[in-house]
Interface confidence: medium
Amino acid sequence: MGRGLLRGLWPLHIVLWTRIASTIPPHVQKSVNNDMIVTDNNGAVKFPQLCKFCDVRFSTCDNQKSCMSNCSITSICEKPQEVCVAVWRKNDENITLETVCHDPKLPYHDFILEDAASPKCIMKEKKKPGETFFMCSCSSDECNDNIIFSEEYNTSNPDLLLVIFQVTGISLLPPLGVAISVIIIFYCYRVNRQQKLSSTWETGKTRKLMEFSEHCAIILEDDRSDISSTCANNINHNTELLPIELDTLVGKGRFAEVYKAKLKQNTSEQFETVAVKIFPYEEYASWKTEKDIFSDINLKHENILQFLTAEERKTELGKQYWLITAFHAKGNLQEYLTRHVISWEDLRKLGSSLARGIAHLHSDHTPCGRPKMPIVHRDLKSSNILVKNDLTCCLCDFGLSLRLDPTLSVDDLANSGQVGTARYMAPEVLESRMNLENVESFKQTDVYSMALVLWEMTSRCNAVGEVKDYEPPFGSKVREHPCVESMKDNVLRDRGRPEIPSFWLNHQGIQMVCETLTECWDHDPEARLTAQCVAERFSELEHLDRLSGRSCSEEKIPEDGSLNTTK
């Protein structure tokens, strides 16, 4: 295996440009040996690096052995010689994390990048007056996304003191004593909690304790999902993965595949049915976005898909990223509407629960008043809404969602770009003319998309009289997967919206729904209703139905307002 073979298989100029290192396997035609594309004294080629590049951002990373950057921007470095860099700084006021590309030949913050060839970003402390300053550099795929402060410290390593001594020195012994006591107490608490958790798994109880706030614990008897929610909103950092057996593929999206799966009980043949959303390694960013959204305990809501845990799994195909959630056998709303005609009562329940889910997502507090980060979905559509057994909605697929963090700058918001599904994009998104000064603008785009989904529901409601086959919004005007340009023609140029036939308005309830959704798809974002307002309107509809003593589909509603659905 020498030059002759290489020359025969490769264009000559590539052979000349590459350093001949070990042999090429005989079955590999035109294969680049891993040592070949390098920048070295021999003058071979180096390709630019992919790095996290968010410049300086505020960070919550503190006293951890490693942190994720939480930077959503991956950039291909401008110059081939550049590597990924992360800088962590802490002073009296705040903690910041900087992620950039930088040429290791040049100093950064007055320091030489000594570890530029490392595949991992392992932080080293640098002397800077008035602040704690750590820096790392590395050269592998987005390696500055995971910054490591201590490689020696392993969660199973009891020798914590040794590591702390190395970092802080003996002068910190008194506060260390207190810290270690706290760690031991916390550890005992976690072990105890873990034992309780696993016993909950074994019993498979569906009784749910949701701690909304210290003074607000609500127990819900919930038969809508198999999942024991005690485990919800956890990230599975354990090396031991949940005993899950994938069953059938139930959905496939842009970024991931969704499987129905069996979560086995420790002691028996019993299992709980769960959904597993599997992201390939390339879609790490989508998985992380969704995981970060779900990990917020304050997101918990009956109209938002119940999250169990997130896992990183190694398979023969390479690394995969899993999200494990409740499973809803009725599938997504689009599938459900395609297969079923719905009653007025169904429409009211589906519409009301959808609005409540979005209102909770958008809200800056929980139902109990605890502060919560508002979130915008940015890809609301009928295929991203699941139908629960009681015929209420729950929102799913948060891969494009955005936390409306008050620290986000206008530039950050601008960088989030034109995302979503063209068919459901609001006019201002299609036109890329959102008011980034006002975070409410993002919520208003969700409300537009919600209006189209409400229209889809209404179009399949038998209370309007004649019901046509299911058609998505603008179904007769655009092809199956319309592009932004064709949606611009319909929504912007023609000011088009899905048709509301006049006979729909003969039904008083549907007339009110149509008035509501018309206000929600207004061309002017400021004129649209809020999701909370829509939820309140649906509550009024329910109240009116109760007062009238019957639903308009001639189903009696008991005086107490409880609904008997035998579907």
Partner: nanobody
């Protein structure tokens, strides 16, 4: 056997357009980030553009931003490069390349397979 076969190159006038294709076989196309890389006469290799396997996120070198568009058709196992507003400095042999799987690669070793290239000449 892994194969990458480029086509679509040729002679074009400045300001003109070309569309390059790269037919891939012998591996699961939907699992890999794919790249276009070029080499101008007498110069080093230069990356042009990259595309993620699913979700179709794209990356471009500054020199081609706004003029070139990378895309892929996973159902046809084909990678494309639409080149508009071509300039003399775009003259090069264009290669499509498959990225090493997973996160095993570094900037020093990014690809495990290349095509044999297609020549694009921009001249009046």
């Amino acid at each position: 056997e892994v194969q990458l076969l480029e086509s679509g190159g040729g002679l074009v006038q400045p300001g003109g357009s070309l569309r390059l294709s790269c037919a891939a076989s012998g591996f699961t196309f939907t699992e890999y980030r794919m790249w276009w890389v070029r080499q101008a006469p007498g110069k080093g290799l230069e990356w042009v553009s990259a595309i993620e396997p699913i979700g179709n996120r794209t990356y471009y070198a500054d020199s081609v931003k706004g003029r070139f568009t990378i895309s892929r058709d996973n159902s046809k196992n084909t990678l494309y490069l639409q080149m508009n507003s071509l300039r003399a400095e775009d003259t090069a042999v264009y290669y499509c390349a498959k990225q090493i799987p997973g996160r095993k690669w570094t900037a020093n070793s990014r690809f495990d397979y290349w095509g044999q290239g297609t020549l694009v000449t921009v001249s009046s």
